[in-house]
């Protein structure tokens, strides 16, 4: 399987699929009301967590959980039956130009967002990377300025498609820049829909 | 909440709701031809308003409203039942470097494309951001240019996600900057389209 | 902004939703397709591996998708470019980026831009260097039209399963 | 193996035009900018300007802007330099180049004279 | 207009002798956000397109001989050939990629002593 996808910025993919999880702890007996029995479906809203960056929301503003699909912190999202998903994700980064001087190369940020699968057949062990984008930021620096920081700059790296989903797989968000993350309403976001 | 989002041009937040509609006219009583009966969707197309900046065509090219959705200049996109909608939005930009000189800060533009509901529940003077997309752009400035413009730059701000919606509320898209919006086909679009 | 804070009552009007059921059939026309990452120079898409599909009548010719019957399809594309370090030799001038999903069908004599993105990066500015653009959309589509993409930096894809691909399913 | 191949030089008249091709092979044409520069007999080098073939996109030294105007077929991987009111001093060899690869094609020769 | 200044504007040399050109651009090359310098050197027989050597100051271009190097950084660039060889006899351009018009030096002819 394709684990490797884009240049990440820790070594241990297993590590780094891990270390990029951070969602919000629900406990899976109490899966969020059911408004459409009939249509497996989720949207969960990027929230921050304290000490991992980046969590998830599952009943604040227009986040919820449809119809048996759950949601822990520890194994990402499961949906509740066999089908042909729709998964999507976006998340909205934002930082500032570090002072003048310094490496330029220290300057450039490439901001990568990922979806992953694991559980089921692929094992607890084996996150496979089904979806991801990617954003090289490089703020422009103003020469002059040898102290302070730059203006803030903002992008979005989003996506999404279709998979195949069976019951007990499990899917997740893993992102390369945790701190840069912007939870500002309507920006960072994760979902999926059963399509058939 | 957060409610900053990115800064804007305006500095009123309801005049700014509704400057950013721009949509075009069109009777409520006559939706498009119904190809689908049983799915509300829509797909609409970015066009140039005189005077607003963004407008949004229903009936040129690949563009459509289906199954009783609605739109108007005024109000936006109506949805003609309660559901869940996977809401999408895309609009592409262009832009000049401005001439050599000056402060890099200066020339920095984050362009914003925000997907809003109002009405319904949420009252006419409530609207609420739903999903939100950002990219700020530097055209990197040739320094020695007094004068004349750098090359074009293009890029483009999408997004989509699902939201459930019922009968009643409206949708529309503000962006931060109308005058910068690329009208190619294909380009700057939105739609909605119900999944449950 | 517009937005302001959820009213109070928010998170119950959500759950006060009548229920609704999608009735699902077994299969609907669905495909997803991933660029083949052993041509280098070009953008083929492929259908039979890495969790690539086709399902319920959409087929693939000549490097496009075969619409299989007539209504609505939500259509999306992604590609995601790349530049190496010190790529660019004599010249600072940007790098043109773009990719556009395109329907040719028996109404237009032409092909017509559906979905489309563009970038100008800087590759001698920043490296290296990563890009995407994604972009999804509904559409309504006719039995025998055809879905197909062009790319402008094919040189700088990456090419991989999760990176660059192409799909469409009816709603 | 990557070409560029200058084309449509010869002898015109003071006053007249010139069309000039640049046909591109063995690399992608799109998306890397097309420089014209001249060069006139026993002189240097002066650049003229630059197109994107992609988007459309062009950049033209002062000296020449309204008289040059730059264009591109990129379903024929060509690019093209149409120069007007041709004066004596516009004889030059005239170069198209790839400068984010580095290729230079040979060159065409126009002579302007009565 | 960034001006370039080339100098000498012609040299004789022997082959096997170490020649140094020298390019000065009216302002900087060096580009603050990555360091680095947007100057080329072209090399030019009669007859003949130039040919890419040197860019970003100092990279030698892909089957470039080695006895070629640049270096320099801000205005003042240096074109060395170490050991002059019977091919090397030809003209050679500096050019400024930092900032619209593209500029060249004049040229600096190299001839057989």
């Known amino acids: 399987q394709d684990q490797g996808g884009l240049v990440t910025e820790t070594a241990d993919p297993g590590a780094q699929a891990q270390q990029g999880l951070g969602f919000q702890k629900l406990p899976e007996e109490e899966p969020e009301t059911d408004l459409s029995p009939g249509l497996p479906a989720a949207h969960l809203i990027g929230a921050p967590l304290k000490g991992q960056g980046l969590g998830w929301e599952t009943t604040k503003e227009q986040a919820f959980l449809t119809s048996g699909t759950q949601f822990s912190d520890a194994e990402g999202l499961a949906l509740p039956q066999d089908g042909l998903y729709y998964l999507y994700c976006l998340v909205g980064y934002r930082g500032r130009a570090p002072p003048g001087g310094g490496d330029p190369q220290g300057r450039s940020v490439t901001l990568r967002s990922s979806l992953y699968r694991a559980g089921g057949a692929y094992g607890p062990g084996t996150p496979e990377l089904l979806l991801e984008g990617a954003e090289t930021v490089t703020p422009v620096l103003d020469p002059a300025r040898r102290q302070g920081y730059g203006p803030l700059w903002y992008t979005s790296v989003g996506f999404g498609g279709l998979v195949q989903l069976r019951r007990g797989e499990r899917v997740y968000v893993n992102i390369s820049h945790p701190d840069m993350v912007d939870f500002a309403r309507g920006k960072t976001f994760f979902g999926a829909v059963m399509v058939g | 909440q957060d409610q900053g989002g990115l800064v804007t041009e305006t500095a009123d937040p309801g005049a700014q709701a509704q400057q950013g509609l721009g949509f075009q006219k069109l009777p409520e009583e006559e939706p498009e031809t119904d190809l689908s009966p049983g799915l509300p969707a829509a797909h609409l197309i970015g066009a140039p308003l005189k005077g607003q900046g963004l407008g949004w065509e229903t009936t040129k090219e690949q563009a459509f409203l289906t199954s009783g959705t609605q739109f108007s200049d005024a109000e936006g996109l109506a949805l003609p039942q309660d559901g869940l909608y996977y809401l999408y939005c895309l609009v592409g930009y262009r832009g000049r470097a401005p001439p050599g000189g000056g402060d890099p800060q200066g020339r920095s533009v984050t362009l914003r494309s925000s997907l809003y509901r109002a009405g319904g529940a949420y009252g006419p003077g409530t609207p609420e951001l739903l999903l939100e997309g950002a990219e700020t752009v530097t055209p990197v400035l040739d320094p020695a240019r007094r004068q004349g413009y750098g090359p074009l730059w293009y890029t483009s701000v999408g997004f989509g996600g699902l939201v459930q919606l019922r009968r009643g509320e409206r949708v529309y898209v503000n962006i931060s900057h109308p005058d910068m919006v690329d009208f190619a086909r294909g380009k700057t679009f939105f739609g909605a389209v119900m999944v449950g | 902004l517009p937005g302001v804070g959820l009213t109070p009552s928010a998170a119950q009007t959500a759950r006060q939703h009548p229920k609704m059921h999608l009735a699902h059939s077994t299969l609907k026309p669905a495909a997803h397709l991933i660029g083949d990452p052993s041509k280098q120079n070009s953008l083929l898409w492929r259908a039979n591996t890495d969790r690539a599909f086709l399902q319920d009548g959409f087929s693939l010719s000549n490097n496009s998708l075969l619409v299989p019957t007539s209504g609505i399809y939500f259509v999306y594309s992604q590609v995601v470019f790349s530049g190496k370090a010190y790529s660019p030799k004599a010249t600072s001038s940007p790098l043109y980026l773009a990719h556009e999903v395109q329907l040719f069908s028996s109404q237009y004599p032409f092909h017509v831009p559906l979905l489309s993105s563009q970038k100008m990066v800087y590759p001698g500015l920043q490296e290296p260097w990563l890009h995407s653009m994604y972009h999804g959309a509904a559409f309504q589509l006719t039995q025998g039209d055809q879905l197909s993409t062009h790319t402008d930096g094919i040189p700088h894809l990456v090419l991989s399963p999760s990176t660059v691909f192409f799909g469409a399913f009816a709603l | 193996e990557v070409q560029l191949v200058e084309s449509g030089g010869g002898l015109v008249q003071p006053g007249g035009s010139l069309r000039l091709s640049c046909a591109a092979s063995g690399y992608t044409f799109s998306s890397y900018w097309i420089e014209w520069v001249r060069q006139a007999p026993g002189k240097g080098l002066e650049w003229v300007g630059e197109?994107?073939?992609?988007?459309?996109?062009?950049i033209y030294n002062e000296k020449f802007k309204g008289r040059a105007t730059f264009s591109a077929d990129n379903s024929k991987n060509t690019a093209y330099l149409q120069m007007n009111s041709l004066r004596a001093e516009d004889t030059a060899v005239y170069y198209c180049?790839?400068?984010?690869?580095?290729?230079w094609g040979q060159g065409t020769l126009v002579t302007v004279s009565s | 207009d960034i001006q370039m200044t080339q100098s000498p504007s012609s040299l004789s040399a022997s082959v096997g002798d170490r020649v140094t050109i020298t390019c000065k651009s009216s302002q900087s090359l060096l580009y603050s956000t990555n360091q680095k310098n947007f100057l080329a050197w072209y090399q030019q027989k009669p007859g003949k397109a130039p040919k890419l050597l040197i860019y970003?100051?100092?990279t030698r271009d892909s089957g470039v001989p080695s006895r070629f190097s640049g270096s320099g950084s801000g205005t003042d660039f240096t074109l060395t050939i170490s050991s002059l060889q019977p091919e090397d006899f030809a003209t050679y351009y500096c050019q400024q990629y930092y900032s619209y018009p593209r500029t060249f030096g004049q040229g600096t002819k190299v001839e057989i002593k």
């Open positions: 197109i994107n073939p992609g988007s459309g996109s062009t």
């Open positions: 970003w100051a100092s």
């Open positions: 180049a790839d400068g984010y690869h580095g290729y």
